[in-house]
Interface confidence: medium
């Protein structure tokens, strides 16, 4: 069952999922000047069986001007830089560490993908929050939100997190302290 709305917004914080429950949809969004191919899938879908989950269907973008360029290749380094790279890389590194039954990892980028990923979460999904760079986390409880079904309606639990000015960004569960680059995540929501 899809969650009716987005996870709660926390001032000066971003959220992301460690892994995505089966049924999660990722919109096939293309960057400006590109569009999804006409015969292409509207979205990618986390699907699978009891032993293995993966993203079904691939997103494909083509130039709005061109008609027949439907190839799908791994983005070149310069193309990847157009994305919010630190955000994506930290998500994918974290996703590589997990293999939860009934969950998918972060999907790899596709050529000419839009800068922001739009996810549609399902009931039971957990997202984790961290303060953006320059803000410190004050925890009163779990810095996470879970989409739950109550009385036939979906709702997200409220994360117990306050982000106050100064110091390093807090880390997501299982994430190593950055060795070389203390950049943290950019100031934008990582998943929607």
């Amino acid at each position: 069952e899809l969650c009716d709305d987005d996870p709660p917004k926390i001032t000066h914080a971003t959220f992301k999922a460690v892994a995505y429950k089966e049924g999660t949809m990722l919109n096939c969004e293309c960057k400006r000047g590109f569009r999804r191919i006409k015969s292409g899938s509207p979205y990618m879908l986390c699907t699978g069986n009891s032993s293995h989950s993966s993203w079904d269907n691939q997103c494909q973008c083509t130039s709005s001007a061109a008609r027949n360029t439907t190839k799908q290749v791994t983005p070149q380094p310069e193309e990847q830089k157009e994305r919010k790279t630190t955000e994506m890389q930290s998500q994918m590194q974290l996703a590589d560490q997990v293999s939860l039954p009934g969950h998918c990892r972060e999907p790899p980028p596709w050529e000419n993908e839009a800068t922001e990923r739009i996810y549609h979460f399902v009931v039971g999904q957990t997202v984790y929050y961290q303060c953006v760079q320059g803000y410190r986390a004050l925890h009163r409880g779990p810095a996470e939100s879970v989409c739950k079904m109550t009385h036939g309606k979906t709702r997200w639990t409220q994360p117990q997190l306050i982000c106050t000015g100064e110091t390093e960004p807090s880390q997501f569960p299982g994430e190593e302290e950055p060795q070389a680059s203390p950049d943290g995540l950019p100031e934008s929501e990582t998943s929607r």
Partner: antibody, heavy 118, light 111 residues
Framework: EVQLVQSGAEVKKPGESLKISCKGP????????IAWVRQRPGKGLEWMGI????????RYSPTFEGHVTLSADMSLTTAYLQWSSLRASDTAMYYC???????????WGKGTMVTVSS | QSALTQPASVSGSPGQSITIFCTGT?????????VSWYQQHPGKAPKLMIY???KRPSGVSNRFSGSKSGNTASLTISGLQAEDEADYYC??????????FGGGTQLTVLS
């Protein structure tokens, strides 16, 4: 609870134009695909096409392509189905529906009855 | 793009089980697990009953179940009740990134 609210019934003459609407929720309208489905009196459901309001990408059933146009206005969180020249055979109930997970239509409008008669 | 094939009508007595079949091709039903079933009462909008071949949305009775074999999907309603009397439609995603519905099956619950 997410709802799709459709415009009211219409009575038109053959050759006239028409635009019916389907209003969705403000917070998520531009993130979901909206499909249109026709049901002629006493008949079954026919898939007409689907549109993504986020960028107005539209896909059509071959049966309906060229006869109807799908559009959307994100600022009004509304999807539209329009005809430039109606035929008597367009008389039907028209439903809009949200494309949910697993490629199923999980939320439906109540329908708009279109009657085309001279 | 041909409609999926369903029987025009089926009937059963209260408490019985009935199965509605939906036959397509390898380009729709057989090629994807994206088969869904809808219930429509007279004068009402369709309601999603089964998605992804066999999954039930919350709020749908577990008397409704779905399955698929090859190019044919099926909807089974067990413990038939009077309120199950309605039209039932199958639908599938297709290889051309469109959707197709079945012609519909009228279920009559005999009294």
């Amino acid at each position: 609870e997410v709802q799709l609210v459709q415009s009211g019934a219409e009575v038109k003459k053959p050759g006239e134009s028409l635009k019916i609407s389907c209003k969705g929720p403000e917070y998520s309208f531009n993130r979901y695909w909206i499909a249109w489905v026709r049901q002629r009196p006493g008949k079954g459901l026919e898939w007409m096409g689907i549109i993504y309001p986020g960028d107005s990408d539209a896909r059509y059933s071959p049966t309906f392509e060229g006869h109807v146009t799908l559009s959307a206005d994100m600022s009004l969180t509304t999807a539209y189905l329009q005809w430039s020249s109606l035929r008597a055979s367009d008389t039907a109930m028209y439903y809009c529906a949200r494309l949910g997970s697993y490629y199923a239509f999980d939320i439906w409008g109540k329908g708009t009855m279109v009657t085309v008669s001279s | 793009q041909s409609a999926l094939t369903q029987p025009a009508s089926v009937s059963g007595s209260p408490g019985q089980s009935i199965t509605i079949f939906c036959t397509g091709t390898s380009s729709d039903v057989g090629g994807y697990n994206y088969v869904s079933w809808y219930q429509q009462h007279p004068g009402k909008a369709p309601k999603l009953m089964i998605y992804d071949v066999s999954k039930r949305p919350s709020g749908v009775s577990n008397r409704f179940s779905g399955s698929k074999s090859g190019n044919t999907a099926s909807l089974t309603i067990s413990g038939l009740q009077a309120e199950d009397e309605a039209d039932y439609y199958c639908s599938s995603y297709t290889s051309s990134s469109t959707w197709v519905f079945g012609g519909g099956t009228q279920l009559t619950v005999l009294s």
